[in-house]
């Protein structure tokens, strides 16, 4: 398998489906934030 550098600018939900994602690439973080990020679970709710 090859390595690659993930695009850092924008991401689209893999599982949402075309009619729901509407081909848009939301400017949000990848789906997993490192645990080194915010300590409080509530602070993750900003990622909408």
């Amino acid at each position: 398998m090859e390595d690659f550098n993930m695009e850092s600018d924008s991401f689209e939900d893999f599982w949402k489906g075309e009619d729901l994602s509407n081909y848009s690439y939301s400017s949000t973080l990848p789906p997993f934030l490192l645990d080194a990020a915010p300590c409080e679970p509530e602070s993750l709710e900003i990622n909408k």
Partner: antibody, heavy 120, light 116 residues
């Protein structure tokens, strides 16, 4: 590297329920959907539905409406899938999966699978 | 009739190029869908390979070699997974999937055997 780690194998009686967990190890569940996909022995994958871990919103496949419940606990980075009124033909490996796509690449995460056996 | 139909098995020699087809049911136009392709080996979950709708709308799975590529055959109303330079480790089951009528639908899969 984030991994999705699922709970262990289960043996259930017909008519009972099973609850499978899916924990993000090395990371935290975020806003992208967690799908649940099952695979009966010798069969292809079958999508059951997804949950948005951020909002808790769900989208269930019509076949499983009324029998499946997907939930999450963000405080422990874990998603759950509960299937009720089990039948022998629910015997399958159950997977959780998530992922995201950039403009040229997609990254997809899958759990290792949980074997659920339904037998009297 | 199934939404997605795949040949049940296919065999080829190492180094060859193989095309795996995923035919959409009549009335469902392949040009309107992203076709997702997965590889699965015994005892492991499916691994996403790529998705393909057109040459301007295609994404490779992370870490998936470029010898796996997608295309479509409009005349056959089918998505195609092309594997070039076939290797023994490519022996696996291959599934296609689409998002159709607000649900993910998977094909029945093709068992690819690498001869020799």
């Amino acid at each position: 590297q984030v991994q999705l780690v699922q709970s262990g194998a289960e043996v259930k009686k017909p008519g009972s329920s099973v609850k499978v967990s899916c924990k993000a190890s090395g990371g935290t569940l975020s806003s992208y959907a967690i799908s649940w996909v099952r695979q009966a022995p010798g069969q292809g994958p079958e999508w059951m539905g997804w949950i948005n871990p951020n909002s808790g919103g769900t989208n269930y496949a019509q076949k499983f409406q009324g029998r499946v419940t997907m939930t999450r606990d963000t405080s422990i980075s874990t998603a759950y899938m509960e299937l009720s009124r089990l039948r022998p033909d629910d015997t399958a490996v159950y997977y959780c999966a998530s992922g995201y796509c950039g403009r040229a690449r997609c990254t997809s995460f899958w759990g290792q699978g949980t074997l659920v056996t339904v037998s009297s | 009739q199934a939404v997605l139909t795949q040949p049940s098995s296919l065999s080829a020699s190492p180094g060859a190029s193989v095309s795996l087809t995923c035919t959409l049911r009549s009335g469902i136009n392949v040009g309107a869908y992203r076709i997702y392709w997965y590889q699965q080996k015994p005892g492991s979950p499916p691994q996403f390979l790529l998705r393909y709708k057109s040459d301007s709308d295609k994404q490779q799975g992370s870490g998936v070699p470029s010898r796996f590529s997608g295309s479509r055959d409009a005349s056959a109303n089918a998505g195609i997974l092309l594997i070039s330079g076939l290797r023994s480790e490519d022996e696996a089951d291959y599934y296609c999937a689409i998002w159709h009528s607000s649900a993910w639908v998977f094909g029945g899969g093709t068992q690819l055997t690498v001869l020799g």
